[in-house]
Structures are given as C-alpha cells and as structure tokens.
C-alpha cells in the first residue's frame, strides 16, 4: 500500500500522458485521480510505466471499483491485466468477445496463465455455452484449449461450434473428451457427402463406436494408420479382418509396423490366423 500524501503543487494530473512516468509511486497515488484513470485507460498501454507504477495504478482502480471493474475499463487494461490475480478477475463480468480478445492478446505467446484460465471461465459461464465465435477465438490463441476442458464442460459445446475445431485443436484430447465431442461432430457434419464427411470427422474418430467404423468401412475412406491407432480399443476389437481391410484400404500394409502396439496388437490376437493370412502381411495371432 502507498501512503496517503498530498499532491505537490502543480503536479495534479489533468490527463494520462507520458509525463507521469517521471512521477514517484507516492506522487502517482496522490496526483492521479482514479476516475480520470478509468476514463483514459486506453492511454496507459502506450506509456512505458514500470511494474511498480502499474501496481499503483491497479491499486487506484481497486479502490474505485471494489466490487470489480466495469467492462469499459477491462477492455482497455492492456498490460495492466498481467497484474490482476484470479481473485480480481472473478469479480468481473466480461460479456464482449472484443474484450476477451484484447486481454488474450496481452498474454499471446505464453502458456495459459491462471489469470487467463479464470478470465475464460468467467466469459464462457457468462455466455452459458461455448459458441462458435468464442471457440474460434480461444483455439486461435490456445490450440490446446478444447482438450483442457473436462468432459462435463465439453458437454456444453453446441454441435454448431464444432465447425470451428481444427485437427490440431484435438491433438491432446483423451478418450473421454473425444467420447463427448464425437457425437457432436457427427451431428454437425451429418449433411456432408461421404468423402467430405470423412475429412471433417476424421479428427474426432477417437470417440467413434464400432457400428460407425463398420459403416465407414463400406465407404472406401482409406483411413490412415495414425487415425486408426487413435480409435477406441473397444471399437476396434469387434471389427473383422475384412472390415479393417476395407477401412484402411491401401494403408492396411501399415498394420505390420504397428503389430506390437495397441489397439492393433489386441485386434490381431482376436482374429483367426486364416483370416490374418489373407492380408499377406505375416501377422501372427
């Protein structure tokens, strides 16, 4: 805390400008009106304040808005956002996607901090669901965002938002998350034709049940081995040799290189040797 001291004569700030960088901490406290600061927050970012000076400015805003900052101030926080604690952010009510983008921009290139995680949580809860625009924004800044959500949180993602998801956004998702996302993707892409549908659904297939894989095997999709290896074990095991051959198409030869890995290893064990031999790959059950 900065002590309350009278502002020296002639030092009272009329506006937020570069002259303030020469003010000592106590002078900033005494000479900068909090209401002026709040209305001219957009100027703060252009001024090279020290971290100590930013602490004073934050303190002034905290005093002015003990219940939490209004969105008009939040949108222009800029680097002052980095001074906020998750406890501060929990008091906010952020509803504008532009505000969210402005604050995410400040943290760009860094890991998701507890502050950013709290901000996103507040924003999404305020909206009630992860709509497409929000998901688009979040995955642009944090490709792993979707996979950082629990299956329960993912259940609030509407199928329409799935169109915003890129394959790399699902890289770190685990099977429980894909179990939630796959039915949404299936719904979202249901009106697409065979080959286009497969291109879109491919990243989500780690959540697909056996019957959907059987259906895909009838559509000449030529699934690559990387996708096959991410399928659920319980979905792969009931597939016949013929179905796997149709599902993989020319990629079926890749099974040999994966024969010691799950789920291929367990699938091989379940097959009759005569059936495996029809593949001509030397797979041993």
């Amino acid at each position: 805390e900065v002590e309350k001291t009278a502002c020296p004569s002639g030092k009272k700030a009329r506006e937020i400008d570069e002259s303030l960088i020469f003010y000592k901490k106590w002078e900033l406290e005494a000479c900068v009106d909090a209401a002026l600061l709040a209305t001219q927050m957009d100027r703060v970012n252009a001024i090279p304040f020290t971290y100590e000076q930013l602490d004073v400015l934050k303190h002034k805003l905290d005093e002015l808005y003990p219940q939490g900052y209004p969105e008009s101030v939040i949108q222009h926080l800029g680097y002052l956002f980095l001074k906020m604690s998750p406890e501060d952010i929990r008091k906010w009510n952020v509803t504008s996607l532009e505000t969210l983008k402005a604050l995410l921009e400040v943290n760009k290139g860094h890991e998701m901090s507890p502050q950013v995680a709290t901000l996103i949580d507040r924003f999404v809860k305020g909206r009630g669901q992860l709509d497409k625009d929000t998901l688009d924004t979040l995955t642009a800044f944090y490709p792993g965002y979707l996979c950082s959500l629990s299956p329960e949180e993912l259940s609030s993602v509407p199928p329409s938002s799935i169109w915003a998801v890129r394959p790399q956004d699902l890289d770190t998702c685990d099977p429980r998350q894909l179990d939630v996302l796959y039915p949404k993707a299936r719904l979202a892409f249901q009106n697409m034709n065979g080959s286009e549908y497969f291109v879109k659904i491919q990243s989500f297939l780690g959540g697909a049940p056996t019957e959907d894989l059987k259906a895909l095997s009838q559509q000449n999709v030529s699934m690559d081995l990387a996708t096959f290896m991410k399928l659920r074990t319980d979905a792969v095991l009931p597939l016949t040799v013929a179905e796997v051959q149709k599902l993989l198409g020319p990629h079926v030869e890749g099974l040999k290189a994966e024969e010691r890995h799950r789920p291929v290893r367990d699938w091989i064990l379940r097959q009759r040797q005569d059936d495996l031999d029809t593949l001509g790959l030397g797979l041993q059950g």
Epitope: P175, H261, R265, L269
Partner: antibody
Amino acid sequence: QVQLQESGPGLVKPSETLSLTCTVSGGSVSSRDDLWSWIRQPPGKGLEWIGYIYYSGSTNYNPSLKSRVTISVDTSKNQFSLKLSSVTAADTAVYYCARDNVFTGFDIWGQGTMVTVSS
Amino acid sequence: DIQMTQSPSSLSASVGDRVTITCRASQSISSYLNWYQQKPGKAPKLLIYAASSLQSGVPSRFSGSGSGTDFTLTISSLQPEDFATYYCQQPYDASYTFGGGTKVEIK
C-alpha cells in the same frame, strides 16, 4: 469376483528353473478381453513386467528376459504358468500374476509370492 | 523399448495437500497410460487407465491427464490412506514398461 493365486517353491537354486502357477477363480482364462501376465518386484525396487499369454496360447515377453521365459496356459485347469530358466540372485523377487484387461489395465492381481534364489 | 520416467521419485506431503506426480514416455503412447498405487507388502492396485479414466471403486480425488508423452496423476486432497508408492505404466507398446515409482510420504 475374479481372484488370482500364485503357487510354487519359495526357494530356487542358482542356474535352476523357477516355476510358478497362477490359478484363476471366479472367472475364466478363456476370456477374450483378458491377457494373463506375470510381473515381478525385487526387494525394495520397482515393478518389472515379465510377459503375458492369451487363452489362444499367443505369448509376448519382456525383451530383456525373453531368452529365459516360457509362459503357458491350461484352460482345462483355469491356470497359467511361468518358467524362468538359469536363475541367478538377481531373479530374487516377489512374483505376481495379474489379469490385463485390454480395456483397462492390470485390474486384478494375485497377492504375490516371494521367490529367493540362493544355494 | 519405451522408457517411462516418473518424477519426483519421492515427496513429502500433509493430509489435505494437493499432490501431483508426472510421468514422461520416451515416445508417444497416445492415451495408453495407467497409474497404480502400491502399499508395503501388498499387490499394486489400478487407479487410472487410458490416462484419465477412473477405475471402478477408486475415490474421485484421484485424477489423471495427458496424452502423447506427458502425463499427470493428481490427488486433489491427500488422505491418510493415500501414503503409498505410485507407478505409471504404458500398455501401448508390447514391452509394457513401468515407471520407477513415486513414494508419497507423510511430512
């Protein structure tokens, strides 16, 4: 529910063959969803997987032990067995049999049996 | 063979603490990662399978996360019965390797 019980000698002489049997009760070794494994733990050390067998007779062994290990299954007795040849003091350990469910992991274990290799 | 590296090898914690153990695979193992708990003189017990799925009967304070090469076991609020050694294990590759273990002791 399924239970596993190891049996076999607790003392084996160096250069001889260690033989253990695991009896499965409350379930079947012929389950299509399960592999039957042997795992060991030297005193004060971590876990080392030895190998598994499927009801069909297919086996898979730890590469570091492969030349000395044989695992077999007897579906009529609902048992599977481990043979480890040319043992040395380094093979002294608690030996566990375990069920490896292909959807989960080693979900059921025997209580373990201590085998000491000493002359 | 795939190597599994656990850290830390031991840790001291108090009842109520949040405890995190990490496991790193020498190559990608997708989500094929299991966690076991072992108490002295007892057989290991399966806690988490497929990186994040809780085994039936295991308290919800245990959770797992991760995919590819980096995985985490978290105990949200350590209980007296949780003091034990924890092992990760990969069933992805046929070499079925275990991590070296993490001993959780009372502070």
